[in-house]
């Protein structure tokens, strides 16, 4: 679609005569009829296939034609066409005399024609005017012409329709050749596709307008490159959505079971060594001079009664010191200067000489010990309490204070953790050395089978078009992560483009 424009510039009819040679009375009131048709080697009669236009009376005899003439006329004259410009044309311009105001052919005198010219030629679409002048015996016409495209039409033949737009169907302006030029932030054949925020993940992110980054289900972050872990995941991460890959030292479905109590809580005091021995279970190996479950109790070095033969112990900053009774010497008063003649055995102990009377040995009655039977027997020295139980002297007897989970005289019996039926929903309980373990029936999980889980919702492969399926354990549902070009809860719909321009 375009317009052939004809600019009439000057008409000369000095003698003021008609084509027949007869003069106009009082002068030739001149108007023009223009016929534009397809190229003909010889201009032929017949329809003006590209259009016709008439002017009002523009002047008398000889006159210059002003641009945008008054009196209802237009200069340049417009001959619109609604087809591909062929590049060639035939143009016929007639000058007529109108004695009155009625310019219809049938209202004119029989010989009202002043002059008629016809040209044929090639003409490319463009802004430049072609100037021409046609002379007959009595008249001269100077004019120029050009072909330009109508609004929204482009290209060498005005055949390319392009209407700038900024809506759902596209975001573009038109280049001189009619090709689309996308507005900033848009791309694609029809500039319908927004350019997402720079760095927005190709698969996991999308956008509905430029510089946006909206995340697909299971992804988060400014660029949608961070997966969302399973709902309730405590000490874990993910590499794909809804995962819960436990951090070191944590276990369980939600990574909330502490497998490294030593590191996370540092329960052992006074430089003791901590060993993990199961979930939330540990053992402290105390440094010398400390005792207790967490080695929190400072031992006096004299508590182990290191002084023999009735020597008395004195605590010192760097150890202890034995004060030996008469007749004894050595670090622990272990060397004797006595013999049986000195009656060295206390508490009714009987003395036996040895090495020809050079030294002796005491045989102690029950409940006494030591080289001179000077010590009451400490029933705790042999560490009779098992499983970390604490030994307590109680007069002539002793007793063990057991750690939780143990019982018996010497804490040798394991209390059954399963006795109180801790496993929910029909879970099977197993006693372990350091606690218990529940084996859960289908549909349940957790340390005590307390969490209801679904059978894997992705097992039935519900997602189409090679989409990735994720099971949302918290809702017993699945989520499909669509590949580019597909939408829908199961990625079942391809994203289509309009087949042609929708305007």
């Amino acid at each position: 679609s375009g317009v052939f424009q004809l600019q009439l510039q000057e008409f000369i009819n000095e003698r003021g005569v008609l084509a027949s040679g007869r003069p106009c009375e009082p002068g030739c009131r001149t108007f023009f009829r223009v016929c534009l048709k397809h190229f003909q080697a010889v201009v032929s009669p017949g329809p003006c296939t590209f259009g016709t236009v008439s002017t009002p009376v523009l002047g008398t005899n000889s006159f210059a034609v002003r641009d945008d003439s008054s009196g209802g006329g237009r200069n340049p004259l417009q001959l619109p066409f609604n087809f591909t410009w062929p590049g060639t044309f035939s143009l016929i311009i007639e000058a007529w005399h109108a004695p009155g105001d009625d310019l219809r052919p049938e209202a004119l005198p029989p010989d009202a024609l002043i002059s008629k010219i016809a040209i044929q030629g090639s003409l490319a679409v463009g802004q430049n005017w072609l100037l021409d002048e046609q002379t007959s015996t009595l008249t001269r016409l100077r004019y120029s012409y050009r072909v330009i495209c109508s609004d929204n039409y482009y290209g060498d033949n005005c055949s390319r329709l392009c209407k700038k737009r900024n809506d759902h169907f596209g975001h573009y302006v038109c280049q001189p050749d009619g090709n689309l030029s996308c507005l900033p932030g848009w791309t694609g054949e029809y500039c319908q596709q927004p350019i997402c925020l720079s760095g927005c993940h190709e698969q996991n992110g999308y956008c509905s307008k430029p510089a946006e980054c909206l995340c697909r289900p299971g992804w988060q972050g400014r660029l949608c490159n961070e997966c969302i872990p399973h709902n309730g995941c405590r000490h874990g991460t993910c590499s794909t959505p809804w995962q819960c890959t436990c951090d070191e030292g944590w276990g369980g479905l939600f990574c909330d079971q502490d497998l490294n109590y030593c590191t996370h809580h540092s329960p052992c005091k006074n430089g003791a060594t901590c060993s993990n021995s199961g979930q939330r279970s540990y053992t402290c190996t105390c440094r010398p001079g400390y005792t207790g479950v967490d080695c929190e109790l400072e031992l006096s070095e004299c508590d182990s009664n290191p002084c023999r033969n009735g020597g008395s112990c004195k605590d010192q900053e760097d150890g202890y010191h034995c004060l030996c009774p008469p007749g004894y010497y050595g670090l622990h008063c272990e060397h004797s200067t006595l013999s049986c003649a000195d009656s060295p055995c206390f508490n009714g102990g009987s003395c036996r000489e040895r090495n020809q009377g050079a030294n002796y040995a005491c045989e102690c009655p029950p409940n006494f010990t030591g080289s001179n039977c000077e010590k009451k027997v400490d029933r705790c020295t042999s560490n009779p309490c098992a499983n970390g139980g604490q030994c307590l002297n109680r007069g002539p007897s002793r007793m063990c204070r057991c750690r939780p989970g143990f019982t018996g005289t010497y804490c040798e019996l394991h209390v059954s953790d399963c006795a109180r039926n801790p496993c929910a929903h029909g879970g099977t309980c197993h006693d372990l050395e350091n606690g218990l373990m529940c084996t859960c029936p289908a549909g349940f999980s957790g340390r005590r089978c307390e969490v209801r889980t679904s059978i894997d919702a992705c097992a039935s492969s519900p997602c189409f078009n090679r989409a990735t399926c994720y099971t949302d354990l918290s809702t017993d549902t699945f989520v499909c992560n669509c590949p580019y070009g597909f939408v829908g809860s199961r990625c079942e719909f391809p994203v289509g483009l309009p087949p042609s321009f929708p305007w």
């Epitope: 084509a19 397809h38 010889v42 009669p45 296939t49 590209f50 087809f83 024609l113 008629k116 010219i117």
Partner: antibody
Framework: QVQLVQSGAEVKKPGASVKISCKAS????????IHWVKQAPGQGLEWIGY????????NYNQKFKGRVTFTTDTSTSTAYMELRSLRSDDTAVYYC????????????WGQGTLVTVSS | DIVMTQSPDSLAVSLGERATISCRAS??????????MKWFQQKPGQPPKLLIY???NQGSGVPDRFSGSGSGTDFTLTISSLQAEDVAVYYC?????????FGGGTKVEIK
């Protein structure tokens, strides 16, 4: 009113020439075209060609080209057709008709001129 | 050359009845949305008279009972209610390409 008046009937020998006239009145002769059409006895219509009234622009049917010539005299608003090397099958009524650029077609016709070619 | 074929060759129709004449061109006579097709009426001893131009436009002074239709290669002239003065030979003619060509004619008579 528009009128096209043709010259009278002609009898010619084979090989001779004939020149038929068509005088126009009632309209601006130079604005229009003049067609020439042949109609043999009892036959249909056959287009010979045309001439533009405003300049020597002509178009001939190849079948007649070389034997036919169109001319005009704008001072008398008259068109002429000359047919040379006459043959017996040139015996026919020859019509002139006017035509225009704004497609009405051949809207006015002359009364026809009978040309008889006989030895 | 474009060949114009008319049918039928002759047609007898009762007064007041519809008469339909067809004309087929050997190739399209349309150009830039215009059909370069005309219909003429010729009565005995008279020159032809223009009835229809551009396939469907009535010539000056032509009665409304004459109408034309068609495009491309197939065209029709219809006389909606035949009158006695319509007895004549009717010709179709194309002016798209030189040489302009006429159909062979259809003779319309009263039945």
């Amino acid at each position: 009113q528009v009128q096209l008046v043709q010259s009278g009937a002609e009898v010619k020998k084979p090989g001779a020439s004939v020149k038929i006239s068509c005088k126009a009145s009632g309209y601006s002769f130079t604005a229009y075209y003049i067609h020439w059409v042949k109609q043999a006895p009892g036959q249909g219509l056959e287009w010979i060609g045309y001439i533009a009234g405003y300049k020597d622009a002509t178009n001939y049917n190849q079948k007649f080209k070389g034997r036919v010539t169109f001319t005009t005299d704008t001072s008398t608003s008259t068109a002429y057709m000359e047919l040379r090397s006459l043959r017996s099958d040139d015996t026919a009524v020859y019509y002139c008709a006017r035509d225009y650029d704004y497609d009405v077609g051949m809207d006015y016709w002359g009364q026809g001129t009978l040309v008889t070619v006989s030895s | 050359d474009i060949v114009m074929t008319q049918s039928p060759d002759s047609l007898a129709v009762s007064l007041g009845e519809r008469a339909t004449i067809s004309c087929r061109a050997s190739e399209s006579v349309d150009n830039y949305g215009i059909s370069f097709m005309k219909w003429f009426q010729q009565k005995p001893g008279q020159p032809p008279k223009l009835l229809i131009y551009a396939a469907s436009n009535q010539g000056s002074g032509v009665p409304d009972r004459f109408s034309g239709s068609g495009s491309g290669t197939d065209f029709t002239l219809t006389i909606s209610s035949l009158q006695a003065e319509d007895v004549a030979v009717y010709y179709c003619q194309q002016s798209k390409e030189v040489p302009w060509t006429f159909g062979g004619g259809t003779k319309v008579e009263i039945k």
